[in-house]
């Protein structure tokens, strides 16, 4: 029967007793930077080309016995998971292996850098189709390794890496912390985060998604027909590399941003038990398990968005946090979140010719996060309209006044340390959906975009009694672009998007009291692109 | 890649040359920074990646590496250029004493220097 991991990544419409993906990734080349491999294993023989690249440190210990099967173990298994005939994800993908890890599975940042440079030079000498680079390794945070990954990604290469097996914040490791890399955590057959001895999968905002990574059957270097189960975030990353190869084979023109958005979009949502993660990391960790798209074509009509969390600002009074979208993405909205509730909101601002989302800490606050909603919106022209604090009882409001521009997100930012909770709640006048409304002491920022066929609507969900969490979701066919709270009072910890749902978090009910001041409204801006839908119909 | 770097592996004699002058001193106010792994057991002191500014050409990378060797030799230190980077990042990989870091950070075109560190199969 089909191994659990292949079943898990297969959409229901393909599920049978066997794993039969629609396309095997045959147009894609996957580079593997790992240990040496047993290239004559029946799973991968003829599919994996061993390059002459080798840059590894000597093994530790004077009595180390170099046994070929042990030296090849990690890399052979991963090559099998990516493209193995029996147990591979992308059975049609061809691979090239570079040896950057020694027989003990240890390498160096410098060796990995030279390996990445080798790939870039190979790409320049002999351009082929789409390239995926699998980095099933991790070291401490490295500015230079992250920089090299960024350069390679900007040269059109898709990099997939292991989040790390340290049961820790993936942002503390490289290349897991590189924003341009697709970073993968590991889950098991029960869709739970993988525990590995006393440690386990890494987590946090630097993880893009999770994938099967426990008890994964694959080629064993013990013998040319042997199979073995292995576990780790490397195995998880290999699944995503395989899925990426298949998606790129079906749509070779996909950019890294488009591929990442699709990987997120087609993932299984909210299946991971977040209690496994440290409490402060739960909100930052994506609850996504990778899966193949139900059909390899026709996804182009959708408006894809993802949520990007910033690093924590730190607790100093004037501390700020910045969340950025990828170069090919549009920042459609910006929100902020603080566990203590002490924040001074957020604003969208231009930085290096691109909009970023900046959140502001408040005096006595433990720090804030900026949360960017990053979307794929071709031919978009977006700008930010700002209204300074109104000081009028009606509150501050701003709208998109340019012809053809629609509201995609609202942000509010205030200079005062504390927005009083005694102010009456501000309600948006009906019939004015293209308008952001906020507290009278706050400046309000509207994200206004023009793109062919783009239409947006505002959806609200208000709860009169205080609740720790208020949510509002966009319906089928619409994509959440903006998420904010009404009113911007101090008991609101912040707002953020989780998939297609806008979440507004408030202080613990017990500390708020049940007066009308506790009323919270979650405001979602839901958009869709008729232009993308038409374009996709024309293609079909 | 060793052949490629063979030219730089010999000890450079401490001869005064235009290479060793201050003709290309770093621009005022831009100080190169040093980075190392926060996890101590994973550090590999003695090997450093010298990253040069983005638009630096290969010939400038080679020249900067030679200059470092020359200046180190004059101070009695042996250095070995293990690799010259180009294609992704401009720079070079050097085996040298940590005592030379201050000197290396002052070289022209240097953006930052990172001490090598270990990575592990996951």
């Amino acid at each position: 029967s089909i191994p659990w991991n292949l079943e898990r990544i297969t959409p229901p419409r393909y599920r049978a007793d066997e794993y039969q993906p629609p396309d095997g990734g045959s147009l894609v080349e996957v580079y593997l930077l790992d240990t040496s491999i047993q290239s004559d294993h029946r799973e991968i023989e003829g599919r994996v080309m061993v390059t002459d690249f080798e840059n590894v440190p000597e093994e530790d210990g004077t009595r180390f016995h170099r046994q070929a099967s042990k030296c090849d173990s990690h890399g052979t298994h991963l090559a099998g998971v990516v493209s193995g005939r029996d147990a591979g994800v992308a059975k049609g993908a061809s691979m090239r292996s570079l040896r950057v890890l020694n027989c003990q599975g240890k390498g160096t940042v410098s060796g990995t850098l030279i390996g990445l440079e080798f790939i870039r030079k190979s790409q320049l000498v002999q351009p082929v189709g789409p390239l995926v680079v699998l980095l099933p390794l991790a070291g401490g945070y490295s500015r230079v390794l992250n920089a090299a990954c960024q350069r390679l990604a900007r040269a059109g290469v898709v990099l997939v890496t292991a989040a790390g097996n340290f049961r820790d914040d993936a942002c503390l490791y490289s290349p897991a912390s590189a924003p341009e890399v697709i970073t993968v955590g590991a889950t098991n057959a029960q869709d739970q985060p993988v525990t590995l001895g006393t440690l386990g999968t890494n987590f946090g905002r630097c993880v893009d998604l999770f994938a099967p990574g426990e008890d994964i059957i694959g080629a064993s270097s013990d013998c040319s027909t042997c199979f073995v189960s292995q576990s780790g975030t490397s195995q998880a990353a290999a699944h995503v590399a395989g899925i990426a190869a298949m998606m790129l084979s079906a749509e070779p023109e996909l950019t890294l941003a488009e591929l990442r958005q699709r990987l997120i979009h087609f993932s299984a949502k909210d299946v991971i038990n977040e209690a496994w993660f440290p409490e402060d990391q739960r909100v930052l960790t994506p609850n996504l398990v990778a899966a193949l798209p139900p059909s390899t074509h026709g996804a182009g009509w959708q408006l894809f968005c993802r949520t990007v969390w910033s690093a924590h600002s730190g607790p100093t009074r004037m501390a700020t946090a910045v969340a950025r979208c990828a170069p090919d993405e549009e920042l459609l909205s910006c929100s902020s979140f603080s566990r203590s509730g002490k924040r001074r909101g957020e604003r969208m601002e231009a930085q290096g010719g691109k909009l970023v989302c900046r959140a502001h800490n408040a005096f006595g606050g433990e720090g804030v996060y900026a949360i960017a909603r990053c979307c794929l919106l071709p031919q978009a022209n977006c700008s930010v309209h700002t209204a300074p604090p109104a000081e009028a009882s009606m509150g501050t409001r701003v709208h998109c006044h340019q012809q053809g521009h629609v509201l995609t997100g609202c942000s509010s930012h205030w200079e005062v340390e504390d927005l009083g909770t005694h102010k009456p709640p501000v309600l948006r006048p009906r019939g004015q959906p293209n308008q952001c409304v906020g507290h009278r002491e706050a400046s309000i920022h509207a994200s206004c975009c023009h793109a062919p066929g783009l239409e947006c609507k505002v959806k609200e969900h208000g709860i009169p009694a205080p609740q720790e969490q208020v949510t509002v979701a966009c319906e089928e066919g619409w994509t959440l672009t903006g998420c904010s709270a009404l009113p911007g009072t101090s008991h609101v910890l912040g707002a953020y998007a989780v998939d297609n749902t806008c979440v507004v978090r408030s202080r613990d009910v017990s500390t708020t009291g049940s007066t009308s001041e506790g009323a919270v409204t979650a405001v979602a801006i839901c958009c869709r692109s008729r232009h993308l839908a038409q374009a996709s119909q024309e293609l079909q | 890649q060793e052949d490629e770097d063979g030219d730089y592996e010999e000890l450079v004699l401490a001869l005064r040359s235009e290479e060793d002058g201050l003709a290309e001193a770093p621009e005022h106010g831009t100080t190169a920074t040093f980075h190392r792994c926060a996890k101590d057991p994973w550090r590999l002191p003695g090997t450093y990646v010298v990253v040069l500014k983005e638009e630096t050409h290969l010939s400038q990378s080679e020249r900067t590496a030679r200059r470092l060797q020359a200046q180190a030799a004059r101070r009695g230190y042996l250095t070995k250029i293990l690799h010259v980077f180009h294609g992704l990042l401009p720079g070079f990989l050097v085996k040298m004493s940590g005592d030379l870091l201050e000197l290396a950070l002052k070289l022209p075109h240097v953006d930052y220097i990172e001490e090598d560190s270990s990575v592990f199969a996951q």
């Epitope: 029967s1 049978a16 007793d17 066997e18 794993y19 039969q20 095997g24 029946r42 023989e45 003829g46 599919r47 099967s69 173990s73 005939r85 029996d86 147990a87 059975k91 049609g92 059957i217 064993s220 270097s221 013990d222 013998c223 040319s224 027909t225 042997c226 199979f227 073995v228 189960s229 | -």
Partner: antibody
């Protein structure tokens, strides 16, 4: 149900060519390896070689390398064993067998094709 | 190539009695990563294709009566029929599947005494 159906018995003269077939049904033919096994009259089993129909990758026993060709047509879920020039010593029963998942041992066998080579 | 040698070549056992067949491989077929022996046993009755009985040296294939059992590790293996039945008359083959070329033992013929 899962089965392998082989082509019928063949009587051939030495020097002639021959191609026998093995059609799989009831499962995803491209995802399982097919081996060919020879059994000469009154003798034991000899593994000849294997094919993965998904990409037509083959691996032959050194004893049979160059003597026979194994191929597959995944569009009709059929594997083949062929000879370009038969010898009298090729007289035998030939079985195709499907791999068990993740191990080259054989859970499903064809009924066998008897090949007789005689002048 | 791994050479598989079976003993005895033939065996006559009374109905209800135990039959034991041995198989030796020229090199170990036990692998450390999953601690499994890559050895199988097949039964072939006259005029029929072989049938898989045991794999991983000791795992019974579904539908195989529990009077058939496999044991051994490394290079020495045994197939035991605990209580021979009339329908067990056949030739039994061991097979290693740890590496190409796959090899079979020469076969052991089991008859009723």
């Amino acid at each position: 149900q899962v089965q392998l159906v082989q082509s019928g018995a063949e009587v051939k003269k030495p020097g002639e060519s021959l191609k026998i077939s093995c059609k799989g049904s009831g499962y995803s033919f491209t995802n399982y390896w097919i081996s060919w096994v020879r059994q000469m009259p009154g003798k034991g089993l000899e593994w000849m070689g294997i094919i993965y129909p998904g990409d037509s990758y083959t691996n032959y026993s050194p004893s049979f390398q160059g003597q026979v060709t194994i191929s597959a047509d995944k569009s009709i879920s059929t594997a083949y064993l062929q000879w370009s020039s038969l010898k009298a010593s090729d007289t035998a029963m030939y079985y195709c067998a499907r791999d068990y998942a993740y191990k080259p041992l054989f859970d499903i066998w064809g009924q066998g094709t008897l090949v007789t080579v005689s002048s | 190539d791994i050479v598989m040698t079976q003993s005895p070549d033939s065996l006559a056992v009374s109905l209800g009695e135990r039959a034991t067949i041995n198989c030796r491989s020229s090199q170990s077929v036990l692998y450390s990563s999953n601690n499994k022996n890559y050895l199988a046993w097949y039964q072939q009755k006259p005029g029929q294709p072989p049938k898989l009985l045991i794999y991983w040296a000791s795992t019974r294939e579904s539908g195989v009566p529990d009077r058939f059992s496999g044991s051994g590790s490394g290079t020495d293996f045994t197939l035991t029929i605990s209580s021979l039945q009339a329908e067990d008359v056949a030739v039994y083959y061991c097979q290693q599947y740890s590496s190409f070329p796959i090899t079979f033992g020469q076969g052991t013929k089991v008859e009723i005494k």
